[in-house]
């Protein structure tokens, strides 16, 4: 999937299987990614688990779990708030569109999470105070935490190189990372479809083009569109909403 | 160890900032400090071996001397409202202030800096 980190770095990651997206003293978010096509290096999110940890007199531990074709509007125990404590309503789930769009507000940590199902796969977006982002017991032992540190270099897909291949008339769009790409999606069509929804040629637009060329699945146009829309709602600095191409950083630079 | 609760209650009580209260706010600030000191003292049994506890104790001592607060005197009333009856329903609007990040954790400073992370597509 494509990842926009807390530090506004943009990466495309292979990260197949279960990976921690957020892991701090208040919250743990884990995603499971699966290949979009057999033999493809590109993956998309098929499962999402969010654990809100027990917090003072506010909330009991609550688990939210979403999978492909199952986007619940409640926590795993059936509740829609933080439990029996006095401050239980400082954690709330709201269903925006049944089976497609859920918003979780964790007021006790100033955090808003948006989970969507777009096509077969899930998208995730979060707004969180820096103080909460950095509330980790031991910075050194936190290991990989994708939203904070980005993906390891060996898990990144260089989609700028991929795009150069795709634009080149001498090479087919099916060049790496996916050996099984539908023939039906020429580069120009992908560009046109993405331009419809994403008029600014930023990295969301580039991600959209990449996804259409990689999968032939038009739902990924919507995924990029909603990711940008969620960014508009959740990003505190509207000037930084659109990210543009730059040389790729090492994962250390993301921390 | 509930020392963090003491910290956040102190921040919540000192809306004009924990480091430089206006001169006319000093009595109120000192009252909040005494409340903070009392709160930390009450956590001593369960926190006394932990760094957070000792940092709070030393921080209180420093702030008391900086603002010439006397050890004895009034304490500030906690802002948390009384708990509802045990049979209260799931719909509660009167959460303690500590359960509202913007009200509690950041009364002592400017609005928090928010960050955004997103994951989508392939």
């Amino acid at each position: 999937p494509h990842l926009r980190t807390f530090t506004d770095h943009f990466q495309t990651c292979k990260v197949q299987g279960a990976w921690p997206l957020i892991d701090n003293n208040y919250l743990n978010v884990q995603v499971t990614n699966t290949p979009v096509l057999p033999g493809s290096a590109a993956t998309a999110t098929s499962k999402l688990t969010i654990i809100f940890k027990n917090f003072q007199e506010c909330v009991d531990q609550k688990v939210y779990q979403a999978e492909m074709d199952e986007l619940p509007s409640a926590f795993a125990d059936g509740s829609k708030n933080g439990g029996d404590k006095h401050g239980a309503n400082s954690l709330k789930i709201t269903e925006k569109v049944s089976g497609q769009h859920v918003e979780i507000q964790a007021k006790y940590i100033g955090t808003t999470i948006v989970v969507r199902q777009v096509g077969r796969y899930l998208t995730f977006a979060v707004r969180m105070p820096e103080e909460v982002v950095n509330a980790v017991e031991d910075r050194d032992s936190q290991g990989l935490y994708l939203c904070l540190r980005g993906c390891p270099l060996n898990q990144q897909i260089d989609f700028q190189a991929f795009r150069a291949n795709a634009e080149s008339p001498r090479r087919p769009a099916a060049a790496s990372p996916s050996p099984v790409v539908p023939e039906t999606f020429p580069y120009e069509t992908a560009v046109a479809k993405c331009k419809e929804k994403l008029p600014v040629e930023d990295l969301y637009y580039q991600a959209c083009v990449f996804d259409l060329l990689t999968t032939g699945d038009v739902n990924f146009t919507l995924a990029a569109y909603y990711a940008l829309e969620d960014g508009k709602m959740l990003h505190s600095n509207k000037d930084k909403l659109h990210l543009f191409e730059r040389t790729r950083e090492l994962p250390g630079a993301v921390a | 160890c509930k020392i963090l609760k003491c910290n956040s209650e102190f921040w919540s009580a000192t809306s004009s900032g924990s480091h430089a209260p206006a001169s006319d706010d000093v009595p109120e600030f000192c009252a909040a400090l005494r409340t903070y000191a009392l709160c930390t003292r009450r956590t001593a049994r369960t926190c006394r071996g932990d760094l957070a506890y000792h940092s709070a104790v030393h921080g209180i001592e420093d702030l008391m001397s900086q603002h010439n607060c006397s050890k004895d005197g009034p304490t500030s009333q906690p802002r948390v409202r009384t708990l509802p009856p045990a049979g209260d329903s799931q719909e509660r609007s009167d959460s303690p202030e500590i359960c509202h990040y913007e009200k509690s954790f950041h009364k002592h400073s400017a609005a928090p800096n928010y960050t955004h992370c997103g994951l989508f597509g392939d």
Partner: antibody
Framework: EVQLVESGGGLVQPGGSLRLSCAAS????????MNWIRQAPGKGLEWIGM????????HYADSVKGRFTISRDNSKNTLYLQMNSLRAEDTAVYYC????????WGQGTMVTVSS | DVVLTQSPLSLPVTLGQPASISCRSS???????????LEWFQQRPGQSPRLLIY???TRFSGVPDRFSGSGSGTDFTLKISRVEAEDVGVYYC?????????FGQGTKLEIK
């Protein structure tokens, strides 16, 4: 994830000495007081002692005072228990636990004092 | 030293039924500030102890809400609303109010 791993247990003769270690990870070790607790075979839990985050204070149970010493090396994220003048009644599983009041515990190491 | 006396020492319970363990202290566990520092630990067979409840009634992170603690002064209770198979083990109360800290002798919960 908080992890505490005790080591150094084994068989020792009465009057002998043993040094137990507890390797900590998953939290900022140097921020927390630490405890040692033991459990004799088939018996209940007995608190042995605790050490402050910076080693400035140590507290011991009367049963081990003067024989056992708790220390720590924050640079190595390790807690120690030096046990001298061991007796048969010191035979137990020894646990280290995080915090002034123990919240997370290690899996324990067995100490057998026997001739 | 403060002596904590648990009862019963053995507690056979039917799955799905409630269970209650008592812990009595030889002196009040209320501190001069009015706080009471009593905790409950669970030790499953072959495992290390795990914190369930602190400050008499506050559940520790990740502890199911079928566990609850109550009491004051010298009398305290741990309740399990519906016993599950994974609840089998020994339960200990632990006081932190007075030095030295002390444990109860343990209550063994088993399934009937």
């Amino acid at each position: 994830e908080v992890q505490l791993v005790e080591s150094g247990g084994g068989l020792v003769q009465p009057g002998g000495s043993l040094r137990l270690s507890c390797a900590a990870s998953g939290f900022t070790f140097s921020n927390y007081g630490m405890n040692w607790i033991r459990q004799a075979p088939g018996k209940g839990l007995e608190w042995i002692g605790m050490i402050y985050y910076d080693s400035s204070e140590k507290h011991y149970a009367d049963s081990v005072k003067g024989r056992f010493t708790i220390s720590r090396d924050n640079s190595k994220n390790t807690l120690y228990l030096q046990m001298n003048s061991l007796r048969a009644e010191d035979t137990a599983v020894y646990y280290c636990a995080k915090g002034t009041t123990p919240d997370y515990w290690g899996q324990g190491t067995m100490v057998t004092v026997s001739s | 030293d403060v002596v904590l006396t648990q009862s019963p020492l053995s507690l056979p319970v039917t799955l799905g039924q409630p269970a209650s363990i008592s812990c009595r202290s030889s002196q009040s566990l209320e501190s001069s500030d009015g706080d009471t520092f009593l905790e409950w630990f669970q030790q499953r067979p072959g495992q290390s102890p795990r914190l369930l409840i602190y400050d008499v009634s506050t559940r520790f992170s990740g502890v199911p809400d079928r566990f609850s603690g109550s009491g004051s002064g010298t009398d305290f209770t741990l309740k399990i609303s519906r016993v599950e198979a994974e609840d089998v083990g020994v339960y200990y109360c632990f006081q932190v109010t007075h030095d030295p800290v002390t444990f109860g002798q343990g209550t063994k919960l088993e399934i009937k």
